[in-house]
Interface confidence: low
């Protein structure tokens, strides 16, 4: 016996209590695909989310998230708070970069400071939470009576990540 | 819709240097960090550093210092990795992408394939 | 440097069936904000990696559900609920807690 429910397009369901006849989405419900034997639930994007695309009876609404949090996971399902520049997110909320650590962004973590001394070079510019140093010339290269801008940065332990 | 497009594949001499583009679109460019990963025949993905495109700064991986610069042209949206002192171990295929959420890469370029040969 | 090793290196799978590759750390990649900093890619024949799993667990947008990441320490797993022709390729975890971020060697997922 052929299945009439195929026939039901996007945006019908197939109605088994009406001879399987193909009956529009309630409100507030869609289906993407055809020969669908029920209609889903509309998402609703409530809270920290915002509708990016109203539901239609053939797809389902999008969220985006509220200013001040960004999108995490597979259609947004998640909304994470932002931070500012020097800052991270931390179970507690946003915590400030700790001392030789930065982090020049509103999400992410706090990384090291570069340590200059690696590469032979000296810090002339110091690194703050919203900013890497900046690595200069090795003072051997620096000109007779003239010396860095700054000391240089104290050395992290290799391989410490920031907490 | 968001992409990343790169330059062409390159055939550069030993010892050469070779300068590999980027040029991203349908997002805020300064707004998201790039990234440089190669992949040589046979190897796995090796990441050769990356560039705050807002503000510049660069990082790189030990393994390429003193040989690799990532830079960026903010008004073309584009980012640009320079190799130098070019050998055959650097035969490989190279990406930009660009860091989305949580340091992943979200959006990977189409690669440059770099030959060097003499 | 934070090393990566991922297992099995080869994974022949009849369409249909499940799949599971595995990615040990060398430290552990679990930051304060209670995340650990663990991706997944999929690296298909001719194409560019694509983001599957990010934060260890966390599906990325357009990626189907037959995908999973779970976490236990420094090993972390990717599994495919059902694998099916596309989903051909080389595999690789990827660390970007630490610079320099570093990849696993790989495991190429064929078809039987």
């Known amino acids: 016996l052929q299945d009439l429910c195929s026939n039901c397009p996007a945006g019908t369901f197939c109605d088994n209590n009406r001879s399987q006849i193909c009956s529009p989405c309630p409100p507030n419900s869609f289906s993407s695909a055809g020969g669908q034997r029920t209609c889903d639930i509309c998402r609703q994007c409530k809270g920290v989310f915002k509708t990016r695309k109203e539901c239609s009876s053939t797809s389902n609404a999008e969220c985006d998230c509220i200013s001040g949090y960004h999108c995490l996971g597979a259609e947004c399902s998640m909304c994470e708070q932002d931070c500012k520049q020097g800052q991270e997110l931390t179970k507690k909320g946003c915590k400030d970069c700790c001392f030789g650590t930065f982090n020049d962004q509103k999400r992410g973590i706090c990384r090291p400071w570069t340590n200059c001394s690696l590469d032979g070079k000296s810090v002339l510019v110091n690194g703050t939470k919203e900013r890497d140093v900046v690595c200069g010339p090795s003072p051997a290269d620096l000109s007779p009576g003239a010396s860095s801008a700054t000391p240089p940065a104290p050395a992290r332990e290799p391989g410490h990540s920031p907490q | 819709q968001v992409q990343l497009v790169q330059s062409g594949a390159d055939v550069k001499k030993p010892g050469a240097s070779v300068r590999v583009s980027c040029k991203a679109s349908?997002?805020?460019?300064?707004?998201?960090?790039i990234h440089w990963v190669r992949q040589a025949p046979g190897h796995r993905l090796e990441w050769m550093g990356w560039s705050n495109a807002g503000i510049g700064n660069a990082k790189y991986s030990q393994e390429f210092q003193g040989r690799v610069t990532i830079t960026r042209d903010t008004s073309a949206s584009t980012a640009y990795m320079d190799l130098s002192s070019l050998t055959s171990e650097d035969l490989a295929v190279y990406y930009c992408?660009?860091?989305?959420?949580?340091?992943?890469?979200?959006?990977w370029g189409q690669g440059t394939m770099v030959t060097v040969s003499a | 440097d934070i090393v990566m090793t991922q297992s099995p290196l080869s994974l022949p799978v009849t369409p249909g069936e499940p799949a599971s590759i595995s990615c040990r750390s060398s430290?552990?990649?679990?930051?304060?904000?209670?995340?650990?900093?663990l991706d997944w890619y999929l690296h298909k024949p001719g194409q560019s990696p694509q983001l599957l799993i990010y934060?260890?667990?966390i599906r990325a947008s357009g990626v189907p559900d037959r995908f999973s990441g779970s976490e236990s320490g420094t090993d972390f797993t990717l599994k495919i609920s059902r694998v099916e022709a596309e989903d051909v390729g080389i595999y690789y975890c990827?660390?970007?807690?630490?610079?320099?971020?570093?990849f696993g060697q790989g495991t190429k997922l064929e078809l039987k």
């Open positions: 934060l260890g667990s």
């Open positions: 990827m660390q970007p807690l630490q610079i320099p971020y570093t």
């Open positions: 349908g997002y805020t460019f300064t707004s998201y960090p």
């Open positions: 430290q552990n990649l679990l930051h304060s904000n209670g995340y650990n900093y």
């Open positions: 992408a660009r860091e989305g959420v949580a340091g992943a890469f979200d959006i």
